[in-house]
C-alpha cells in the first residue's frame, strides 16, 4: 500500500457516547488536521473511508454499513450510530484518499453505560454560574445535527436524580434550563434528556453537565494581601530561620490567572545568591475564591539578609498589589554577668 500521512491516534478527542443512544461523530481530519473541508475534498475526487479496531484487538477491520435498520451509516464526514451498542467501543479511523493522496487519523470511541440517575464514567463539562446574579441559563449541549429543525423534540431536565418540576429557582425552558437565582445548593449534575422521532423509531439523547456556583464579578475585588502586614514584625538573630508567609485572597474571576511572587531587594528569588526556598499552597472557598500562600524561607539568615527588602506581590485580572514585610535584626539581650561584674569594678 502507498504511503499515507498518518496523524496517529488522536487521544485529545476521547469521544464518549452513551449506550443505546444515537451518536454522530465527525471525522477529525477536517476539524483539526487538514486545511480544507469535506465538501472541497469530495469535489476534488477524494473518498472518505472508515474502519475500526475493536477494543483489546490489533486487527483493523472495515465498518459494517449493512447492519439491520442501518444501525451504522456514513453521511458526508459523519459516522452515525442509530443507536450505539456497548461493543462499538474501539479506535475508529477515517482515511481520506485518492490515487495520489492519502491522509488518516484514528480516535478512540468509548460507549459507556449510565444508571437510572445518569451516573456514568462520562467526563462531564462544567458550567459556572455566578452567585448573587440575575437569571442565568445552561443549554442542553451537543444535540445539534441529530434531527432537522422541523422536528420538535421533548426535553426533560433533571437535577441529579430528580425531574425538575416546580423547582424553587430552576425553570426548564425547552433546550435551556434557567436559574432564577443560583445558590450554592444548586451545585451538582444536571441532565437533559432529548426525545425525538425518526423513521418510526424514538431516540433519546442524554446530556449531563456539572453546574458550579462561583463568585460574582459584581463582588470581585483586586487581590487582598493579608500577610505580610503592618502588625507583624519578623525579628530574627543571624543564624535563625526566617519564615515569611505571603497570604493573598483572590476573588473568583472567570479565566483570570492569579499570581503571587516575592521579590528580594527588587529581584526575583531565582536571580539572587541567597539560599531561599518558597513553598506555595492554594485553598478555595465554596464559590471558588482562592487563597494562595507562599512561604519564603531562609534557613540560616545573615545580618545582611535582615537588611534586605522582602516584598510580596500579587496580580489578577482585577489589578496588582504589593506589600513589604517588616524584617529587622533582633537586638541581643544584655549579658548580665559581664555588666554586673563591670558594675562592681572588676576588670
Amino acid at each position: 500500500s502507498e504511503r499515507c500521512d498518518d496523524w496517529g491516534l488522536d487521544t485529545m478527542r476521547q469521544i464518549q457516547v452513551f449506550e443505546d443512544e444515537p451518536a454522530r461523530i465527525k471525522c477529525p481530519l477536517f476539524e483539526h488536521f487538514l486545511k480544507f473541508n469535506y465538501s472541497t475534498a469530495h469535489s476534488a475526487g477524494l473518498t472518505l473511508i472508515w474502519y475500526w479496531t475493536r477494543q483489546d484487538r490489533d486487527l483493523e477491520e472495515p465498518i459494517n454499513f449493512r447492519l439491520p435498520e442501518n444501525r451504522i451509516s456514513k453521511e458526508k464526514d459523519v459516522l452515525w450510530f442509530r443507536p450505539t451498542l456497548l461493543n462499538d467501543t474501539g479506535n475508529y479511523t477515517c482515511m481520506l484518499r485518492n490515487t495520489t493522496y492519502c491522509s488518516k487519523v484514528a480516535f478512540p470511541l468509548e460507549v459507556v453505560q449510565k444508571d437510572s440517575c445518569f451516573n456514568s464514567p462520562m467526563k462531564l463539562p462544567v458550567h459556572k454560574l455566578y452567585i448573587e446574579y440575575g437569571i442565568q441559563r445552561i443549554t442542553c449541549p451537543n444535540v445539534d445535527g441529530y434531527f432537522p429543525s422541523s422536528v420538535k423534540p421533548t426535553i426533560t431536565w433533571y437535577m441529579g436524580c430528580y425531574k425538575i418540576q416546580n423547582f424553587n429557582n430552576v425553570i426548564p425552558e425547552g433546550m435551556n434550563l434557567s436559574f432564577l437565582i443560583a445558590l450554592i445548593s444548586n451545585n451538582g449534575n444536571y441532565t437533559c434528556v432529548v426525545t425525538y422521532p425518526e423513521n418510526g423509531r424514538t431516540f433519546h439523547l442524554t446530556r449531563t453537565l456539572t453546574v458550579k456556583v462561583v463568585g460574582s464579578p459584581k463582588n470581585a475585588v483586586p487581590p487582598v494581601i493579608h500577610s505580610p502586614n503592618d502588625h507583624v514584625v519578623y525579628e530574627k538573630e543571624p543564624g535563625e530561620e526566617l519564615l515569611i508567609p505571603c497570604t493573598v485572597y483572590f476573588s473568583f474571576l472567570m479565566d483570570s490567572r492569579n499570581e503571587v511572587w516575592w521579590t528580594i531587594d527588587g529581584k526575583k528569588p531565582d536571580d539572587i545568591t541567597i539560599d531561599v526556598t518558597i513553598n506555595e499552597s492554594i485553598s478555595h472557598s465554596r464559590t471558588e475564591d482562592e487563597t494562595r500562600t507562599q512561604i519564603l524561607s531562609i534557613k540560616k539568615v545573615t545580618s545582611e539578609d535582615l537588611k534586605r527588602s522582602y516584598v510580596c506581590h500579587a496580580r489578577s485580572a482585577k489589578g496588582e498589589v504589593a506589600k513589604a514585610a517588616k524584617v529587622k535584626q533582633k537586638v541581643p539581650a544584655p549579658r548580665y554577668t559581664v555588666e554586673l561584674a563591670c558594675g562592681f569594678g572588676a576588670t
Epitope: 452567585i131 448573587e132 446574579y133 440575575g134 437569571i135 437535577m159 441529579g160 436524580c161 430528580y162 418540576q165 416546580n166 423547582f167 424553587n168 429557582n169 432564577l180 437565582i181 445558590l183 450554592i184 445548593s185 465554596r286
Partner: antibody
Framework: EVQLVESGGGLVQPGGSLRLSCAAS????????VHWVRQAPGKGLVWVSR????????QYAESVKGRFTISRDNAKNTLYLQMNSLRAEDTAVYYC????????????WGQGTLVTVSS | DIQMTQSPSTLSASVGDRVTITCRAS??????LAWYQQKPGKAPKLLIY???SLESGVPSRFSGSGSGTEFTLTISSLQPEDFATYYC?????????FGQGTKVEIK
C-alpha cells in the same frame, strides 16, 4: 446586621384590602429573594409569596393567587404585599423573611404584623 | 404540593434530655431542608439549613441530618431556652411547605 420590620396590619372587613410593608433597617435587604409567610392563630407556618432580588420574578401560593400582589421599592429598601378581596381565612400574623443568597434558607425574619379579617 | 409531616406533634422532655424530631417529605427534596425554632409571640429563628448545616450563632447542641425524604433535628442536651415549637421547611419545590410543627414542652 439587617433587620426586617413589618407594618400595615390591622382589622379589615371581608372583601376589603390592606397593604403590608416590610422595611429593612441596618442595610439593604439583599439575599436571593424576599418572602411573605403567614401563621393563623395557633396554627403552623404557611408560605404566601416571594419576589426575587435580581429579576423581580414573583410567585404566589394557590390560595392567594389573583388576590395578593408582592412588589418592592428598591429606593426605599421596602417590600410590599397588597392584599385584596380579603377573606376570614386570611387572618394571620404575616412575616416577611429573607431568602439567603447562598443557600436555600430564610435567614432573617421580621417580627410579624397581625391581619384580622372580620365583620 | 409536597407534604411535610413532622413527628411527634408534641414532645415532653426534661432539661438535659436528648431530643429527636423527625420530618418526612412526600417526595424527595435532596437536602433542601431547613429547621426553625419559634417561641410564642416571636418570629421563627433559623437553626439548620441544607439539612445538616448549623446556622451561624446557633448552639452546637442542635444538629440536623438526612437527605431525600427523611430528616431529623436533634438537640443533644435540652436547655431551658429550647422549650419551643420546631418547624421543618422544604425549599426545593414550589410552593414552599412547612411541617405542622413539633412543640417541645417541659415534662
Amino acid at each position: 446586621e439587617v433587620q426586617l420590620v413589618e407594618s400595615g396590619g390591622g382589622l379589615v372587613q371581608p372583601g376589603g384590602s390592606l397593604r403590608l410593608s416590610c422595611a429593612a433597617s441596618g442595610g439593604t435587604i439583599g439575599g436571593s429573594a424576599v418572602h411573605w409567610v403567614r401563621q393563623a392563630p395557633g396554627k403552623g407556618l404557611v408560605w404566601v409569596s416571594r419576589i426575587l432580588t435580581y429579576s423581580s420574578t414573583t410567585q404566589y401560593a394557590e390560595s392567594v393567587k389573583g388576590r395578593f400582589t408582592i412588589s418592592r421599592d428598591n429606593a426605599k429598601n421596602t417590600l410590599y404585599l397588597q392584599m385584596n378581596s380579603l377573606r376570614a381565612e386570611d387572618t394571620a400574623v404575616y412575616y416577611c423573611a429573607r431568602g439567603s443568597s447562598e443557600y436555600p434558607k430564610f435567614d432573617i425574619w421580621g417580627q410579624g404584623t397581625l391581619v384580622t379579617v372580620s365583620s | 404540593d409536597i407534604q411535610m409531616t413532622q413527628s411527634p406533634s408534641t414532645l415532653s422532655a426534661s432539661v438535659g434530655d436528648r431530643v429527636t424530631i423527625t420530618c418526612r417529605a412526600s417526595q424527595s427534596i435532596s437536602s433542601w431542608l431547613a429547621w426553625y425554632q419559634q417561641k410564642p409571640g416571636k418570629a421563627p429563628k433559623l437553626l439548620i439549613y441544607d439539612a445538616s448545616s448549623l446556622e451561624s450563632g446557633v448552639p452546637s447542641r442542635f444538629s440536623g441530618s438526612g437527605s431525600g425524604t427523611e430528616f431529623t433535628l436533634t438537640i443533644s442536651s435540652l436547655q431551658p431556652e429550647d422549650f419551643a415549637t420546631y418547624y421543618c421547611h422544604q425549599l426545593l419545590i414550589y410552593p414552599h411547605t412547612f411541617g405542622q410543627g413539633t412543640k417541645v414542652e417541659i415534662k
